[in-house]
Amino acid sequence: DVERTTCPPEKEVHEIDESLIFYKKRELEACVDAALLAAQMDRVDAIPFTYEQLDVLKHKLDELYPQGYPESVIRHLGHLFLKMSPEDIRKWNVTSLETLKALLKVSKGHEMSAQVATLIDRVVVGRGQLDKDTVDTLTAFCPGCLCSLSPERLSSVPPSVIGAVRPQDLDTCGPRQLDVLYPKARLAFQNMSGSEYFVKIRPFLGGAPTEDVKALSQQNVSMDLATFMKLRREAVLPLTVAEVQKLLGPHVEGLKVEEQHSPVRDWILKQRQDDLDTLGLGLQGGIPNGYLILDLSVREALS
């Protein structure tokens, strides 16, 4: 903590301006009034403060606003945002997308994924739902940030907004997030024709159930292998060799180069070897001819 001292009369601060860069840490602490700082936050980012000086300014704001900063201050944090922890941000109530844009710009190029995720979460809470304007802001200023939201937050996305989401915005989404987004996407794109539907739904397919994947295999879609490998393991395992062949089309060739990676590896282990041989890929590890497959999970469920 910064040592408390009294402010020398000649150092008294009446304006937040460039003269402050010559103040030592203890002088800033003693001479800058927190309320003045809050009122003139818009000036702070134009002044080349050191990180140590910014620490002092943050400390003053924390004392003034122990329950969390007001949005008028948050909007003008500028590089002071780099000093915020997720715990600090959790106290905020943010509703303005201009505030979000300003802070996303500041965070670019810095390792602040946890802070940014928390900030986005606060914006969604503050606005009541993940509306189109918020999604547009995220896709424009923070590609991939959509996936930093929890499944609970993502559940507030109306299906009408899904069309604004681009494939690259979903690259870092995990299975639980795609489980939430997929049904919304299915609803949003339901009136599209086959090939157009597939192009749109493709980034969301990591949340698709087996029956939807089977249905796609009947539609001549030629799913690329990267998309196939993002499917849920439970959705892939029940597929037959013929269904996978139809689903992937020419891309089925890629199973050979990815045969050691899940879900390809797990799927191979469940197929009959002579069925795998029809793919013309030299895939090994299937169930040998003449072996009987017992599904013990059924017996366990009955007992």
């Epitope: 292998l225 990267a226 062949q245 180069v257 990676h261």
Partner: antibody
Framework: EVQLVQSGAEVKKPGASVKVSCKAS????????MHWVRQAPGQGLEWMGN????????YYNERFMSRVTMTVDKSTSTAYMELSSLRSEDTAVYYC??????????WGQGTLVTVSS | DIVMTQSPDSLAVSLGERATINCKSS????????????LAWYQQKPGQSPTLLIY???TRESGVPDRFSGSGSGTDFTLTISSLQAEDVAVYYC?????????FGGGTKVEIK
């Protein structure tokens, strides 16, 4: 040693068809897909399609969809590519290439097809 | 279709010097599950068929001299010849095998200065 030996050069008239063969040796023919790629004089490479020699399933670049047919004869380990309704812009060297997974690991020597009236 | 853009179109390099060829794809070639980039590099010497140099963006095909190396991920890739030899005079092509139709770059002609 993997070898892909293609049939000889052909001269065809516009509107005719050409069938190029590619005889494979030195590996298990049904374990690797065969691709066909063409190269117009002084130009780059263009992927035409691929075929699964085990099942005979073939997939074509949409640009050639209505004119190309790829087949295999497992008994002779030979792949074929037939292109119909030839036009002057089909003048090119046609290559067969054995897949190494997805990439093209081994290439035939190429077959020059000249389309001229 | 995925568009592959190679640069430069041609390159003149002194013997023993480094040659660098760039390849840019219009969309990512990264399989984020396996972390494999579906990009290959081929060499085509005058009057010959192409031969495979590199696959998965950076894996050298067996028998390819170690002066050839590939790097990059996502949409930006590079083929480097660390010390150009006379026998490296050729046209070099990148190719994506992420999504059909598999497409090639326009080629880069490498000559000796």
């Amino acid at each position: 040693e993997v070898q892909l030996v293609q049939s000889g050069a052909e001269v065809k008239k516009p509107g005719a068809s050409v069938k190029v063969s590619c005889k494979a040796s030195g590996y298990t023919f049904t374990n690797y897909w065969m691709h066909w790629v063409r190269q117009a004089p002084g130009q780059g490479l263009e992927w035409m399609g691929n075929i699964n020699p085990s099942s005979g399933d073939s997939y074509y670049n949409e640009r050639f969809m209505s004119r190309v047919t790829m087949t295999v004869d497992k008994s002779t380990s030979t792949a074929y590519m037939e292109l119909s309704s030839l036009r002057s812009e089909d003048t090119a060297v046609y290559y067969c290439a054995r897949s190494g997974g997805l990439w093209l690991a081994f290439w035939g020597q190429g077959t020059l097809v000249t389309v001229s009236s | 279709d995925i568009v592959m853009t190679q640069s430069p179109d041609s390159l003149a390099v002194s013997l023993g010097e480094r040659a660098t060829i760039n390849c840019k794809s219009s969309q990512t070639l990264l399989n984020s599950v396996s972390q494999n980039n579906y990009l290959a590099w081929y060499q085509q010497k005058p009057g010959q068929s192409p031969t495979l140099l590199i696959y998965f963006a950076s894996t050298r095909e067996s028998g390819v001299p170690d002066r050839f190396s590939g790097s990059g991920s996502g949409t930006d890739f590079t083929l480097t010849i660390s010390s150009l030899q006379a026998e490296d005079v050729a046209v070099y092509y990148c190719q994506q095998h992420y999504r059909t139709p598999y497409t090639f770059g326009g080629g880069t002609k490498v000559e000796i200065k």
